[in-house]
Interface confidence: low
């Protein structure tokens, strides 16, 4: 049968060789996972399965995305008689697509006497290994480097049965088994020099075409057994209709209507209901930069700005734990929100000999450079002697207040002799409670900081026995002249609440880089942002007005209609299927002729790089 | 599921301003166009004025009628589009419709429900 597109698909495993339960069991497992089955979207792997299993309901599997395993089973026969490809995406062992050994019980007769894999015309990766199959025939009698397409691929087929019936004559010594009907059907080996995969004849017009897996009927893309890469509606194609294509009036990839997803190897409109999109796949599950998030009803994985979300438990009332200590460090890895508190007492910085808890590696409190909010409040009793900052918590956003510390306090700092700034440089609101900071004889800034604008309500301070504010200037501890009036955390540009001029990645600095410099820059409010990469260093003049490749004053390689570009669009997909451009003299980029397939050096059809279309074979484009 | 939610439309003079506004009812993560259509009975649905945005600068596109009395602006923020309407013609009647789209790798696209615009005397 022909490429089709709905299919039957289920999920393979991933046990390996490890069983839970008797035969029976097993069995009833396998019964489940692949009656009905066409495509195993991952392995098949069938082990200790006992010699009465009737396992004709696995007839119907066309596809193992995976790899196959066999092995330590009993049954006479592995009835797969419409598996047509093996993809290996995963392999057995480090590299074996399939994988049949020690399928006999030796107590018995009972074994593996017939892999019925008549139609099996392909592993797309990986190699074989049948080996140690007492009773298993007709292994060697098949030419395995037709079906596997991978030249290098290991193939080890030895110790099998050793008294075998030979093929039927029909077969010309390529067998499954004895019967006229169990002939090996040959793809690859037999196809004339001309053909670059698979074929249906032996004649040089007989050659399949490049996306077909396994075989075909016909030359066409819609005569395949299977597919290479990707069946859309019928037809194997090297990728599903991606997410974006290039729209030639603007110049900018833009939403396809018409996109699909990759789901195993067939393309579909939409992903089934327990997968997500991740770019044009169906997944699983998000991976660990991404987070999943709902679209116009669409569930799809969307990077994350830096770390993922994560949500921690916290310290203090209501939580495990009385403070922050070595036997709960290690919990606070990767958070970004706490729920809850966080307390910094004696006993979890010095150990608690009675709780049998270990002093703490001052070191390991960088863990929580990835907080950016605290939902309940922040007490710090106690802080390593070496540390004079809080810097740690140097990405602390939001102090929640949901929780409050004794007299309702949200933020508490006391009796930290070392301390000299607070370093809370992105704090920027706390949200409920009372601010208390007391005897840390060494703390300079703090009374800098405007808390009325970090606060939602009038703000409530109780701020006293610091370093007296006079000491502090005479000290020249007094925030730096790049700060605004809004006050500052601690010394140098990075920690003031705002600047007097403009800021660079939280950094504040006298102008931005706009007519010199290495790296060019825009300003968006008081904030530099660097030129987009494609835009050309102007010397004494302005590179760009914005962060786009279409806001530079001169482009540094080409430019596509209003965008800078690399390199002009080479084989880029478009409406009507792939784009390619060269650049002129003043480095534009400009249309190829219609016919060119592979790219070209000017416009004309003689200007195309490699083969050119016939000019009745592709519809004139318009740019 | 997000929503978009239009306002600001209504019956106004030749010559009269109007500011329509437009937000999303939820947050949309990487919003990096968006843009107002006009659609007139018989007519198909018209790009009016449309801003995209790389990162947080904006670039905007007029149709030629809109050229010089109507300002686009999006705040990416709050998830939100304005279009100033200056010197209004009886042409510049029609429903108004707002999109916002995710121009990138998996990308989505949310259009509003549309606001009546009505210039007459």
């Known amino acids: 049968s022909e490429v089709g597109n709905s299919q039957a698909v289920c999920p393979g495993t991933l046990n390996g060789l490890s069983v839970t339960g008797d035969a029976e069991n097993q069995y009833q497992t396998l019964y489940k996972l692949y009656e009905r089955c066409e495509v195993v979207m991952g392995n098949l792997e069938i082990v200790l399965t006992g010699h009465n299993a009737d396992l004709s309901f696995l007839q119907w599997i066309r596809e193992v995305t995976g790899y196959v395993l066999v092995a330590m089973n009993e049954f006479s026969t592995l009835p797969l008689p419409n598996l047509r490809v093996v993809r290996g995406t995963q392999v057995y062992d480090g590299k074996f697509a399939i994988f049949v050994m020690l399928n006999y019980n030796t107590n018995s007769s009972h074994a593996l006497r017939q892999l019925r894999l008549t139609q099996l015309t392909e592993i797309l990766s990986g190699g074989v290994y049948i080996e140690k199959n007492d009773k298993l025939c007709h292994m060697d009698t098949i030419d395995w480097r037709d079906i596997v397409r991978d030249r290098d691929a290991e193939i080890v087929v030895k110790d099998n049965g050793r008294s075998c019936p030979p093929c039927h004559e029909v077969c010309k010594g390529r067998c499954w088994g004895p019967g006229s009907e169990d002939c090996q059907t040959l793809t690859k080996t037999i196809c004339a020099p001309q053909c670059n995969g698979r074929c249906f004849g032996r004649a040089p017009n007989e050659c399949c075409h490049e996306e077909c897996a396994g075989g075909c009927t016909g030359p066409l893309q819609t005569h395949c057994f299977a597919c290479r890469h990707f069946n859309d509606s019928g037809a194997c194609v090297p990728l599903c209709p991606q997410p974006l294509i290039y729209n030639k009036l603007t110049f900018q990839l833009e939403p396809n209507p018409d996109t699909k997803y990759q789901y195993g190897s067939v393309c579909v409109r939409s992903c089934p209901h327990n997968f997500v999109v991740d770019q044009s796949s169906c997944v699983r599950a998000c991976p660990s930069n991404k987070m999943e998030v709902e679209k116009n009803g669409l569930k799809m994985c969307e990077p994350c700005a830096g770390l993922c979300p994560k949500a921690c438990e916290g310290t203090g009332a209501g939580s495990h734990y009385q403070t922050v200590d070595s036997s709960n460090i290690d919990s606070f890895v990767n958070c970004t929100k706490i729920l809850g508190n966080l307390d910094f007492l004696i006993t979890g910085l010095e150990g608690d000999p009675w709780r049998n808890i270990s002093a703490l590696d001052p070191e390991k409190l960088n863990v929580f450079r990835t907080v950016r909010e605290i939902t309940g409040y922040l007490n710090i009793q106690s802080w390593p002697k070496h540390m004079h900052n809080f810097s740690v918590f140097s990405n602390l956003e939001t102090i929640g207040g949901r929780s409050l510390y004794n007299r309702g306090f949200s933020l508490l700092i006391m009796k930290n002799d070392n301390v000299t700034s607070l370093g809370l440089r992105s704090l920027r609101e706390v949200s409920a409670g009372r601010v208390y900071i007391t005897e840390n004889r060494r703390l300079c800034y703090l009374h800098t900081v405007q808390w009325a604008a970090l606060s939602r309500r009038r703000a409530d301070l109780d701020i006293r026995n610091n370093k007296p504010r006079g000491k502090c200037q005479q000290e020249g501890k007094v925030c730096d002249p790049l700060c605004s009036a809004d006050g500052c955390w601690g010394p140098g540009p990075a920690q003031c609440l705002s600047c007097r001029h403009y800021s660079r990645r939280g950094v504040c600095v006298e102008s931005c880089s706009f007519t010199q410099g290495e790296t060019r820059e825009f300003a968006e409010g008081t904030e530099c942002f660097e030129c987009h990469p494609e835009c050309e260093r102007v010397e004494g003049g302005i590179t760009c007005n914005g962060s786009g490749a279409d806001t530079c004053t001169r482009c540094a390689h080409y430019r596509d209609g209003p965008h800078c570009v690399e390199r002009c669009p080479e084989g880029i997909l478009g409406e009507r299927g792939p784009i390619y451009k060269y650049p002129d003299s003043s480095r534009e980029c400009r249309p190829c002729h219609e016919n060119c397939t592979r790219g070209c050096t000017g416009p004309l059809l003689q200007d195309c790089l490699g083969d050119a279309l016939p000019s009745a074979r592709r519809a004139p484009t318009v740019i | 599921e997000v929503q978009l939610v239009e306002s600001g439309g209504g019956l106004v003079q030749p010559g009269g301003s109007l500011r329509l506004s437009c937000s999303a009812s939820?947050?949309?993560?990487?919003?990096?166009?968006m843009g107002w259509y006009r659609q007139t009975p018989g007519k198909e649905r018209e790009l009016v004025a449309g801003?995209?945005?790389?990162?947080?600068?904006?670039?905007?596109r007029y149709a030629d009628s809109a050229k010089g009395r109507f300002t686009i602006s999006g705040d990416y923020a709050k998830n939100t589009v304005y279009l100033q309407m200056n010197s209004l013609k009886p042409e510049d009647t029609g429903v108004y419709y707002c999109?916002?789209?995710?121009?990138?790798?998996?990308?989505?696209?949310?259009w509003g429900q549309g606001t009546q615009v009505t210039v007459s005397s």
């Open positions: 939820g947050s949309i993560f990487g919003l990096n166009a």
């Open positions: 801003i995209t945005s790389i990162t947080r600068v904006g670039s905007t």
């Open positions: 999109r916002m789209s995710i121009v990138k790798s998996g990308g989505a696209d949310y």
